[in-house]
Interface confidence: low
């Protein structure tokens, strides 16, 4: 096979968080982040190679304690395919409850053209520290 | 490509437990742990092949309840490159808050000679149970 | 190498939860789940190719809040080899404490014929939502 498509993204909050959608970025200005194959479109990741992918994410809430987290509950993170609309689905969902970090991963088939979106619902802001909040994919097999 | 370099390590508290650095070990005496390519140096993992790696970790605190965890907050786990000094960086960081286990993973480029260190700051002890605390890397692509 | 063996499973609660063993399923009726190589036997995953595997899991408790989780503590999730008996071992263990989701992953050697079992001890029920509870393996190397 050719080199597997991979990406590791950092949070790129260039505008006030008016909507729950997290916008991601990659490149030297954003720590050790990169895209090898997939592309970023308006802060979302677009897949360019069909196959089975390992999708992983970690999100840490900024200025957070277990008290903050429980007070502002529910704070939920969801990763899904948001376009094309015909393939829209939630792939991964976690709530923060009394914690300030969620981290998970899953294997899922993705198709060329699928765009992945990550939504953080609730009132708390995500941390932009490069070792606390990141999102990535790794192509595993056709 | 040659077989990908991989390692899965268990906690090996053979040195004073007085500094925050966790020391790891591998081999038959330590459960299902091994190193295939990377090497252990004084309990830290040294990379021997350039490339993109999936780094994963789970750490469980010993003799812990949510009350203990919140009382002893902040307890934080960080994984980073600690040498060479010129490449020193924190790759992954999580706090325990009211939980007794953290687990996460990320894709990150590593170079031959990079040494990975894991620091558990705070006052609680990590569990040495082989199914509760482990740390590993998997080479993914050049 | 041939295509790596992989599986991503969804919870398949077709019988009342009388015992702590979670039963898994795959296929179109259960979201984006599949088996490529490993096989399901009575809701457990049977390995058909020797090698090193990345095992990952996420389990979310149904109708759960941090209060529920702490009230019903201990609720613990364990993944292990349950047969053949000679290879029986716990590979991965996490407690929920005050959270409603656990997620983790680890590298572990598995052999053809190994059957993986997942046990959820405690009184709370797991969520069957396909984006909240899943279990998978990915062959990494021989």
């Amino acid at each position: 096979h050719p080199e597997p498509h991979t990406a590791e993204l950092q949070l790129n909050l260039t505008v006030p968080r008016k909507d729950p959608t997290l916008r991601w970025g990659a490149g030297p200005a954003l720590g050790r982040s990169f895209t090898h194959g997939p592309e970023l479109e308006e802060g979302h990741l677009r897949i360019h190679q069909d196959g089975l992918y390992m999708v992983h994410i970690q999100v840490t809430l900024a200025i957070c304690s277990s008290t903050t987290a429980s007070r502002h509950h529910p704070t939920t993170l969801a990763v899904g395919i948001c376009s094309p609309a015909s393939r829209s689905i939630s792939l991964l969902r976690l709530s923060f409850h009394q914690g300030c970090t969620i981290a998970s991963q899953r294997l899922t088939p993705l198709a060329r053209g699928d765009t992945l979106c990550t939504n953080l619902t609730g009132t708390l802001l995500p941390s932009r520290n490069t070792d606390e909040t990141f999102f990535g994919v790794q192509w595993v097999r056709p | 490509h040659p077989e990908p370099h991989t390692a899965e390590l268990q906690l090996n508290l053979t040195v004073p437990r007085k500094d925050p650095t966790l020391r790891w070990g591998a081999g038959p005496a330590l459960g299902r742990s091994f190193t295939h390519g990377p090497e252990l140096e004084e309990g830290h993992l040294r990379i021997h092949q350039d490339g993109l790696y999936m780094v994963h970790i789970q750490v469980t605190l010993a003799i812990c309840s949510s009350t203990t965890a919140s009382r002893h907050h902040p307890t934080t786990l960080a994984v980073g490159i600690c040498s060479p000094a010129s490449r020193s960086i924190s790759l992954l960081r999580l706090s325990f808050h009211q939980g007794c286990t953290i687990a996460s993973q990320r894709l990150t480029p590593l170079a031959r000679g990079d040494t990975l260190c894991t620091n558990l700051t705070g006052t609680l002890l990590p569990s040495r149970n082989t199914d509760e605390t482990f740390f590993g890397v998997q080479w993914v692509r050049p | 190498h041939p295509e790596p063996h992989t599986a991503e499973l969804q919870l398949n609660l077709t019988v009342p939860r009388k015992d702590p063993t979670l039963r898994w399923g795959a296929g179109p009726a259960l979201g984006r789940s599949f088996t490529h190589g490993p096989e399901l036997e009575e809701g457990h995953l049977r390995i058909h190719q020797d090698g090193l595997y990345m095992v990952h899991i996420q389990v979310t408790l149904a109708i759960c809040s941090s209060t529920t989780a702490s009230r019903h503590h201990p609720t613990t999730l364990a993944v292990g080899i349950c047969s053949p008996a000679s290879r029986s071992i716990s590979l991965l263990r996490l407690s929920f404490h005050q959270g409603c989701t656990i997620a983790s992953q680890r590298l572990t050697p598995l052999a053809r014929g190994d059957t993986l079992c997942t046990n959820l001890t405690g009184t709370l029920l797991p969520s069957r939502n396909t984006d909240e509870t899943f279990f998978g393996v990915q062959w990494v190397r021989p």
């Epitope: - | 508290l13 705070g122 006052t123 040495r128 | -």
Partner: antibody
Framework: EVQLVESGGGLVQPGGSLRLSCAAS????????MNWVRQAPGKGLEWVSD????????YYADSVKGRFTISRDNSKNSLYLQMNSLRAEDTAVYYC???????????????WGQGTLVTVSS | QAVVTQEPSLTVSPGGTVTLTCGLK?????????PTWYQQTPGQAPRLLIY???TRHSGVPDRFSGSILGNKAALTITGAQADDEAEYFC??????????FGGGTQLTVLG
């Protein structure tokens, strides 16, 4: 209820040996670090030694290093202190103490036995 | 001579407040010394009160509190009671791998 019961103390001549035992009950002995702490008559406390939960790692105070050996038998829920080359200044009540596990840096003793008296005198 | 210093004795009236301190012969005590406090009544084993500067052990009444005051660790008892009469030992982490205990403070509750 956590219980620690020491035994094996007594009168011994300088240069002699004694073996102290501590029987533990009421908790999962095999997950706790264990310690010996001593208290000379009318004096303060002195940490002597500790051993990790699996028995593979031991530490000693400088005053007893090379003379005392701490060990444990998790199958018997027992802690031991082998004391050789005893000196007059080793005279003390010896306590078996459980490390709470609250600290990755320093032993914190949350349960103690009632102690056993060791007298080193000619 | 002791590295960890404590007042040899202190007196308090019932219902009163008293502060016991724990210092270093040379240098200041900080939270990095993980100050721990134990109570010992005559003929009994010590009992853990406070650890990691200010965390009360389970079952310890909230009239006992720990802190850093200036360059010393402190144990404060508010609303002293007759059964608080005991010897109090502090312990500090100074160097690997041990803890160093102070000489103890004999607290008398007058009344």
């Amino acid at each position: 209820e956590v219980q620690l019961v020491e035994s094996g103390g007594g009168l011994v001549q300088p240069g002699g040996s004694l073996r102290l035992s501590c029987a533990a009950s009421g908790f999962t002995f095999s997950v706790y670090y264990m310690n010996w702490v001593r208290q000379a008559p009318g004096k303060g406390l002195e940490w002597v030694s500790d051993i990790n939960n699996e028995g593979g790692t031991t530490y000693y105070a400088d005053s007893v290093k090379g003379r005392f050996t701490i060990s444990r038998d998790n199958s018997k829920n027992s802690l031991y202190l082998q004391m050789n080359s005893l000196r007059a200044e080793d005279t003390a009540v010896y306590y078996c103490a459980r490390d709470a596990g609250y600290s990755n840096h320093v032993p914190i003793f949350d349960s103690w036995g009632q102690g056993t008296l060791v007298t080193v005198s000619s | 001579q002791a590295v960890v210093t404590q007042e040899p004795s202190l007196t308090v009236s019932p219902g009163g407040t008293v502060t016991l301190t724990c210092g270093l012969k040379s240098g200041s005590v900080t939270s990095d010394n993980f100050p721990t406090w134990y109570q010992q009544t005559p003929g009994q084993a010590p009992r853990l009160l406070i650890y990691n500067t200010n965390t009360r052990h389970s079952g310890v009444p909230d009239r006992f509190s720990g802190s850093i005051l200036g360059n010393k660790a402190a144990l404060t008892i508010t609303g002293a009671q007759a059964d608080d009469e005991a010897e109090y030992f502090c312990a500090l982490f100074i160097s690997n791998p041990s803890v160093e205990f102070g000489g103890g403070t004999q607290l008398t509750v007058l009344g």
